[in-house]
C-alpha cells in the first residue's frame, strides 16, 4: 500500500545544445516540482544543545512541521521511544507535561515545538553522544519522530554558547516562508511547463561525460500513499546510554509508567527528498518516523500547554512490545 | 512482558453498576493508554472507551456515553471500568487492551487482558 | 449491525489462500488505519495486522493486510488447522468519533 512519486532522472544536455540556460530552465522545474510534491508531508526537526555553562547540561528543542495538531510528544533518549530509549518527557498540549530525572525542564514553546533542559549530574547524566529523539503523535493519523545527538566536534568550553539556529522558528517562520516559497515555486513550475509545451522540446543525448543524476525521490503526500518514511537513526553508543531509569525505583513492584512498545518495524526505505524541510541547526538530525498519514482527521483543536504534573520519581522504561522490529 | 490481568467473573442485577479492574505487570503504560472492548456472547467486538492514565484524559464512545466511566490508579498500576445501568444486553466478556492512541497516534490495540464475564439477570 | 461489514464465514483447505473482505466508508476505512485482529476460540484477541499491511513481531507472514480506498482485506496463504479462529477488521470512525470493528469473520480449515 505505499506508492511513492518517482520524479524522472533527467540527464544533461550536450554542451552547446541549449546552452547553460536551457539546462536551468529544464532542472528548476524538476527541483520545484520535488518541492510541490514534498510540500505536505509532515516532518519533525531536533536540535541538541550542550550549554557552555554546565558542560554536561544538554537542551534539546524539537518540532513538527505538519499542519495536523499534535496529541502527544515524548521525548527519549537511547533511541526512538520503544525501541530501547528511555523517555524522558511525555507533553500534552491540553493536560500538562509529564517528567522524569534528569529531565529539569520541559515546556511548550510554540504549538507545535518544544525544548527540554536535562540535568547535568549524576549517574544518568547524557554525554555528548547521547542520542535524543522526540515523538510527535497527532491522532488519528499517526506519529512521527525524530532523534539528534550533538555534533563530534561540539566543545561548548571553548565555543561560546550555541546561539538559537533560525529552525528554533521553523514552525512560524518555516510554514510561511516555505509555504510562500513553495507556492511561488508552484506557480512558476506551472508557467514554466505552459511555456515548455508551446515549443519544440530539445533533443536530450546521455552525456558521455557526466554521470546520470541521482533520481530524486518524493513522497506524495497523498492519503492514498499512506507513505512510512523511514531514516535510519544516528547509531547509539552504548558506553554512553544511560542505565535504565530502574535505578530511580525506591519502590518495589512494577512502575505503572514502565513499558513503552516499539511501534513499528525501522525499516529504512531508502533515501528520501528532503527538500521542503528547512535546514536544521548544527548538531541536529532530522528524520520522519514511521506513521506517515498525510489526511488530517477530525479532533477538537488543542489549547496551549495546560498545568503541569509532578514527575513520578520512579521514572519510566522502555519495554520491546509486539510491534517490535522483525 | 506486559500483561494485563483482570478481576473475576460477575453476575449483576438490571439497574445496577459493574465495575471490573486490569492490572499492569511486568511493565505498563507510560504514554499508552488503556481501551476497554466488550464482547456479548457469540457477537463481534465493541469498543467502549479509553483513558491515557498518564494524564487522566479519557474517550468513551458514543454508546456508552454517559454509562461509562473509565478510570485508572497510579499507583497500584490499575484501569477501571465502571458500567452503569445494566441491562440483559451487557451481558458480555469485557476486555481491557493497552492502546496506541496517545502514544503513536493510532487505534490498535497491542496487549489484551485475559477478559471478564459480565453476566446481567434477574 | 456492525459499521465495517466483513463476510461472516470463509474456508479453505490446508496449504489454501483465503481472503477476508472489509468494507467500510470514507469516515473509517477511507481515510483510517485498518487493523486486524484474531481470536482463537476461548481467547482474548490478538493483533495481527496493523496500519494496514504491517505485521507485529512473532506473526507469520503467511498473513498479509492490504488497503484500496474504502475495503481492506486480509489475505492468509498456507492455511493451518491452527489458522481456525474468528478475525475483525478495524479502524477509526471519524464521524463517530471512535473505534469501529467489524462483525468478524470465522475462518473454518476444511
Known amino acids: 500500500m505505499r506508492t511513492e512519486a518517482q520524479v524522472p532522472a533527467l540527464q544533461p544536455p550536450e554542451p552547446g545544445l541549449e546552452g547553460a540556460m536551457g539546462h536551468r530552465t529544464l532542472v528548476l522545474p524538476w527541483v520545484l516540482l520535488t518541492l510541490c510534491v514534498t510540500a505536505g508531508t509532515p516532518e519533525v526537526w531536533v536540535q541538541v544543545r550542550m550549554e557552555a555553562t554546565e558542560l554536561s547540561s544538554f537542551t534539546i528543542r524539537c518540532g513538527f512541521l505538519g499542519s495536523g495538531s499534535i496529541s502527544l510528544v515524548t521525548v527519549s533518549w537511547g533511541g526512538p521511544n520503544g525501541a530501547g530509549g528511555t523517555t524522558l518527557a511525555v507533553l500534552h498540549p491540553e493536560r500538562g507535561i509529564r517528567q522524569w530525572a534528569p529531565a529539569r525542564q520541559a515546556r511548550w514553546e510554540t504549538q507545535s515545538s518544544i525544548s527540554l533542559i536535562l540535568e547535568g549530574s549524576g549517574a544518568s547524566s547524557p554525554c555528548a553522544n547521547t542520542t535524543f529523539c522526540c515523538k510527535f503523535a497527532s491522532f488519528p493519523e499517526g506519529s512521527w519522530e525524530a532523534c539528534g545527538s550533538l555534533p563530534p566536534s561540539s566543545d561548548p568550553g571553548l565555543s561560546a554558547p550555541p546561539t538559537p539556529a533560525p529552525i528554533l522558528r521553523a514552525d512560524l517562520a518555516g510554514i510561511l516562508g516555505v509555504s510562500g516559497v513553495l507556492l511561488f515555486g508552484c506557480v512558476y513550475l506551472l508557467h514554466l511547463l505552459r511555456r515548455h509545451k508551446h515549443r519544440p522540446a530539445p533533443r536530450l543525448q546521455p552525456s558521455r561525460t557526466s554521470p546520470q543524476a541521482p533520481r530524486a525521490r518524493a513522497w506524495a503526500p497523498s492519503q492514498a500513499s499512506q507513505a512510512a518514511l523511514h531514516v535510519p537513526y544516528a547509531t547509539i553508543n552504548t558506553s554512553c546510554r544511560p542505565a535504565t531509569l530502574d535505578t530511580a525505583h525506591p519502590h518495589g513492584g512494577p512502575s505503572w509508567w514502565a513499558s513503552l512498545p516499539t511501534h513499528a518495524a525501522h525499516r529504512p526505505q531508502g533515501p528520501a527528498a528532503w527538500a521542503s524541510t528547512p535546514i536544521p541547526a548544527r548538531g541536529s538530525f532530522v528524520s520522519v518516523e514511521n506513521g506517515l498519514y498525510a489526511q488530517a482527521g477530525e479532533r477538537p483543536p488543542h489549547t496551549g500547554p495546560g498545568l503541569t504534573l509532578f514527575p513520578d520519581p520512579r521514572g519510566p522504561r522502555a519495554m520491546e512490545g509486539p510491534l517490535g522490529v522483525r | 512482558q506486559v500483561q494485563l490481568v483482570q478481576s473475576g467473573a460477575e453476575v449483576k442485577k438490571p439497574g445496577s453498576s459493574v465495575k471490573v479492574s486490569c492490572k499492569a505487570s511486568g511493565g505498563t503504560f507510560n504514554n499508552y493508554g488503556i481501551s476497554w472492548v466488550r464482547q456479548a456472547p457469540g457477537k463481534g467486538l465493541e469498543w467502549m472507551g479509553q483513558i491515557i492514565p498518564l494524564f487522566g484524559t479519557t474517550k468513551y464512545a458514543q454508546k456508552f456515553q454517559g454509562r461509562v466511566t473509565i478510570a485508572a490508579d497510579e499507583p497500584t498500576s490499575t484501569a477501571y471500568m465502571e458500567l452503569g445501568s445494566l441491562r440483559s444486553e451487557d451481558t458480555a466478556i469485557y476486555y481491557c487492551?493497552?492502546?496506541?492512541?496517545?502514544?503513536?497516534?493510532?487505534?490498535?490495540?497491542?496487549?489484551w487482558g485475559q477478559g471478564t464475564l459480565v453476566t446481567v439477570s434477574s | 449491525q456492525s459499521v465495517l461489514t466483513q463476510p461472516p464465514s470463509v474456508s479453505g483447505t490446508p496449504g489454501q489462500k483465503v481472503i477476508i473482505s472489509c468494507s467500510g466508508s470514507s469516515s473509517n476505512i477511507g481515510r483510517h488505519f485498518v487493523f486486524w485482529y484474531q481470536q482463537l476460540p476461548g481467547t482474548a484477541p490478538k493483533l495481527l495486522i496493523y496500519k494496514n499491511d504491517e505485521r507485529p513481531s512473532g506473526v507469520p507472514d503467511r498473513f498479509s493486510g492490504s488497503k484500496s480506498g474504502t475495503s481492506a482485506s486480509l489475505a492468509v496463504s498456507g492455511l493451518r488447522s491452527e489458522d481456525e479462529a474468528d478475525y475483525y477488521c478495524s479502524s477509526w470512525d471519524a464521524a463517530l468519533n471512535g473505534v469501529v470493528f467489524g462483525g468478524g469473520t470465522k475462518l473454518t480449515v476444511l
Open positions: 487492551a493497552r492502546d496506541r492512541m496517545a502514544a503513536d497516534g493510532m487505534a490498535v490495540f497491542d496487549y
